[in-house]
């Protein structure tokens, strides 16, 4: 369901989108993800902030925690203990990096309707979670891990060496949080809560990035973050497991690192519990084309963890890096030794494989010139996964069920024909044993969330259909959207074109390219959005195009790994190629073409502007990378190798924006960055600006004081207003 476009009879009542609509979030949508607590029950926070328990079988709902209780501690989040005796209430949320934050936690006792007094939790806490069974608590405070057997008990301190910016226990350091896990936590309960595994990150030898935070004090603060840039010293990681029933008995036991990994710099990439006494760890060489999955067992006699070489599974890429963006995680079957995993097949497409003994003997479960994206759930008789197989559109996601209980296994698309026009991009959330599941459809029509029976796939009810949004859009002239492909030199370039509401092919329109283009990304997706570029098409009459070129994901390894060790070349070439093809279509004013991007997209847009093609009149780079030597080791080296003479230093040097400073002379360039960007440091734009000044090239710039990579809050409004003015001026559009 795409809201109705323009009906001539109603044309006078229809209006274009305004920038204000976008900045106010007038046309934002809601999704509904149940917080599953059993096979047939879930919790959801109601509009009036009560925490409500829904029982699907009986159709009944119950308020288990009132908004009054939530409000009494200004709680913004909650977590029910698995034994349903207690709820933690989270308040004083204070954001740190992308996922991490600190908060104050209160424990509410449901049996007597009172907050637990005595042995209260310290504040602020960096991470807190319940055990999977009962109501044990694990939490991280000041980089150390603590355990409580019951919420009112005194805590047991598990680690003692935690130190700010030096040793992190149970939480990741900056680079592991952003580029490897990527989570705010680094501790994992075993399925029944017998053991607690955790990572320790030692950042003592990592160089520190320091930047000023101006605040409103007389002297700015300096923010210091251990941040390994390409080629720098990396964190040293160790994994420990402790028995939570008798934590003081033998204390934390270290899990051994596979010998072939430990021989040089390495990363830990993920931990998956299989049973209470079997755990699976994934490791990765610093040169990220070799990954090892290691299955370890608890030795009762020695109270240690044994990881036999026979239970080591190696995944290696000969054409690129291991995995997609990350190395995929295993999903274990009920025998607790075999597992399902997504990795490249012999034809270079990511597919589901079943590994019983060795990777070499893996049984391929899915196959074709498309990719399996995510394994949601494996039950005794079914495997649920998502892919972009249907109708050969890589930017779609449908949910499939493979029956693994019967032979040969049969495959069914659960979502392909549900709401075909409205919904072509799904994710799913499953209850215990996949008894029920929620489908969340992101578009291309207005998003809708529905509840389904896990056995029959029958829709039970609509959880959220965004009726208010649908009504609000009834009198809006939304742009038209097309997703098509270009075939160029044996490369398929998928693109999304956003066209003004009264688009006429015989007229000429200004073109704006929006680019991200980072490795394993995808911009051309069949999703709903009413955003800044929707406004530019609807109100300002621009054509906007997004193009997925080489290096992008879900179309096979040939396209994905094309950029390996040479970032900044083909991504840019493919944007330029697409622009030339768009000009050939006849409706683009070739004197009014612009490009813009954020982060990796800012890097690509900068390089495109400095390509010397004369195609672009102007462009914008928001928070761009300018040299890969300035970015994080884990991300950069995955795609570029090391910046050393005997590895890939030459391309590190050749692929900088600064090296092309002279080429900006004939374009209008707007450079934008937040001064407190912890991710792509302000250093990147500072160096571009310096190179442009040294080359005596005129450009425009805007910095956002104390803003990070997201440029949020009031900065967002200022940013989009500023960029709008810049583009309208570039395209000679009146204000």
């Amino acid at each position: 369901l795409r809201p109705s476009r323009v009906h001539n009879s109603e044309e006078n009542t229809m209006r274009a989108l305004t920038l204000k609509d976008i900045l106010n979030g007038t046309f934002s949508y809601k999704t509904f993800f149940p917080n599953w607590i059993s096979g047939q029950e879930y919790l959801h926070q109601s509009a009036d902030n009560n925490i409500v328990l829904y029982n699907i079988e009986t159709g009944q709902s119950y308020t288990i925690l009132s908004n009054r209780t939530m409000k009494s501690v200004n709680a913004s989040n909650y977590g029910l203990s698995p034994d349903r005796q207690f709820v933690y209430l989270e308040s004083d949320y204070s954001k740190l990096w992308r996922y991490s934050y600190t908060a104050t936690y209160y424990i509410y006792d449901l049996s007597n309707g009172e907050f637990v007094r005595g042995n209260e939790l310290p504040r602020p806490i960096q991470y807190l979670c319940w055990s999977p069974v009962g109501s044990k608590l694990a939490y991280v405070y000041q980089n150390n891990i603590y355990l409580k057997q019951r919420p009112g008990d005194p805590p047991f301190q598990i680690t003692f060496n935690g130190r700010e910016n030096k040793i992190f226990n149970g939480i990741p350091d900056w680079v592991y949080e952003e580029e490897m896990l990527p989570t705010k936590y680094a501790l994992w309960w075993s399925p029944n809560g017998k053991f607690l595994a955790y990572a320790e990150f030692n950042d003592k030898d990592i160089p520190v990035i320091a930047y000023s935070y101006y605040g409103d004090e007389q002297y700015p603060r300096t923010i210091n973050i251990p941040y390994p840039k390409a080629g720098a010293k990396n964190p040293v990681v160790r994994i420990f497991i402790i028995d939570t029933t008798y934590p003081a008995y033998v204390g934390p036991q270290e899990v051994p690192v596979p010998a072939m990994i430990a021989s040089s710099d390495y990363y830990f990439s993920w931990l998956t519990w299989v049973t209470d006494e079997r755990v699976c760890l994934q490791w990765l060489k610093r040169v990220q084309n070799v990954s090892v999955l290691s299955i370890c067992d608890f030795r009762e006699d020695w109270q240690t963890w044994d990881c036999p070489k026979t239970q080591e599974h190696i995944e290696e890429s000969r054409t690129g890096w291991a995995g997609g963006f990350f190395v995929s995680r295993p999903v274990f079957s009920y025998d607790a030794i075999s597992y399902y995993k997504i990795f490249s097949d012999k034809d270079g497409y990511k597919h589901i494989h079943y590994i019983k003994d060795t990777v070499e003997n893996a049984i391929q479960i899915t196959s074709g010139k498309w990719e399996a994206i995510n394994i949601f759930r494996v039950t005794q008789d079914s495997l649920f996964y998502s892919s972009n197989e249907f109708e050969e559109y890589p930017g779609r996601r449908n949910i499939y069920r493979i029956s693994i209980g019967s032979y040969p296994p049969s495959k069914k698309c659960v979502t392909c024909h549900l709401r075909k026009e409205r919904c072509q991009y799904y994710t799913a959330s499953f209850s215990d044993y996949a008894k029920y599941y929620a489908l969340v459809c992101y578009g291309p029509g207005i998003p809708i969330s529905t509840l389904h029976d896990g056995r029959t796939d029958q829709e039970i009810k609509i959880l959220e259909e965004n009726k208010e949004l649908e009504n609000a859009l009834k009198n809006i002239q939304l742009p038209k959207e097309e997703i098509k492909k270009l075939e160029v030199d044996e490369i398929t370039l998928w693109y999304k074109m956003i066209l003004p509401p009264q688009f006429d092919r015989s007229k000429k329109y200004p073109l704006l390219i929006q680019v991200y283009g980072g490795p394993c990304s995808q911009s051309v997706r069949s999703v709903f959005a009413v955003n800044w570029i929707s406004y530019l098409a609807s109100k300002e009459g621009m054509v906007i195009a997004l193009v997925d070129g080489r290096g992008t994901a879900f179309q096979g390894d040939k396209l994905l790994y094309a950029v390996y060790r040479k970032l900044g070349v083909y991504e840019v070439e493919d944007q330029i190629t697409a622009v030339r093809k768009f000009i050939e279509m006849g409706f683009i004013d070739e004197k009014r073409i612009a490009i813009w991007g954020w982060s990796y997209g800012g890097y690509v847009s900068s390089l495109a502007l400095a390509s010397g093609t004369g195609l672009f009149k102007c462009g914008i780079a928001v928070a761009p990378v300018s040299s890969w030597e300035y970015y994080a080791s884990v991300y950069t080296e995955r795609f570029m190798g090391l910046p050393t003479k005997d590895d890939n230093l030459e391309h590190y040097k050749n692929s900088t924006v600064m090296a092309r400073a002279e080429y900006f002379r004939n374009v209008d360039y707007l450079l934008i960055h937040g001064t407190a960007d912890d991710n792509v440091h302000f250093q990147n734009s500072a160096q571009i600006a310096k190179a442009l000044v040294n080359a005596q090239v005129d450009f425009q710039a805007m910095w956002y004081s104390d803003q990070n990579h997201g440029l949020s809050g009031l900065s967002t409004n200022h940013l989009y207003t500023h960029m709008t003015h810049f583009l309208k001026q570039c395209f000679s559009l009146s204000d």
Partner: nanobody, 123 residues
């Protein structure tokens, strides 16, 4: 172990008054969460109200404001009271008990059950 026996059911007029009782045997009654379930013809058994050992109450949204659950630990009895029954409240009402939290709505999570008492609300 705890044995449960319901009473107080029967025919009642809409907007009349109804009080169900559930007597429990056993000395540790006070440590159990107690619940009232009901099952209408052709429907699954559903939790109507529950009360924790600490006295916190919990109601299905469909009966909230109309039904009241209470317990008397001295008498080893739990009650379900309503002053505004509706025809759709017609069902067999079962008393149930469990150790631990009252916040479970699936019958499988409640190990101890009474025999049930029929309640018919006439319009």
């Amino acid at each position: 172990q705890v044995q449960l026996q319901e009473s107080g059911g029967g025919l009642v007029e809409a907007e009349g008054s109804l009080r169900l009782s559930c007597a429990a045997s056993g000395r540790t009654f006070g440590s159990y969460a107690m619940g009232w379930f009901r099952q209408a013809p052709g429907k699954s058994r559903e939790l109507v109200a529950a009360i924790s050992s600490g006295g916190t109450t919990y109601y299905a949204d469909s009966v909230k404001g109309r039904f009241t659950i209470s317990r008397d630990n001295a008498r080893n009895t739990v009650y379900l009271q309503t002053n505004s029954p509706k025809p759709e409240d017609t069902a067999v009402y079962y008393c149930a008990a469990r150790t631990g939290s009252a916040y479970y709505t699936n019958r499988i999570d409640w190990p101890y059950w009474g025999q049930g008492t029929q309640v018919t609300v006439s319009s």
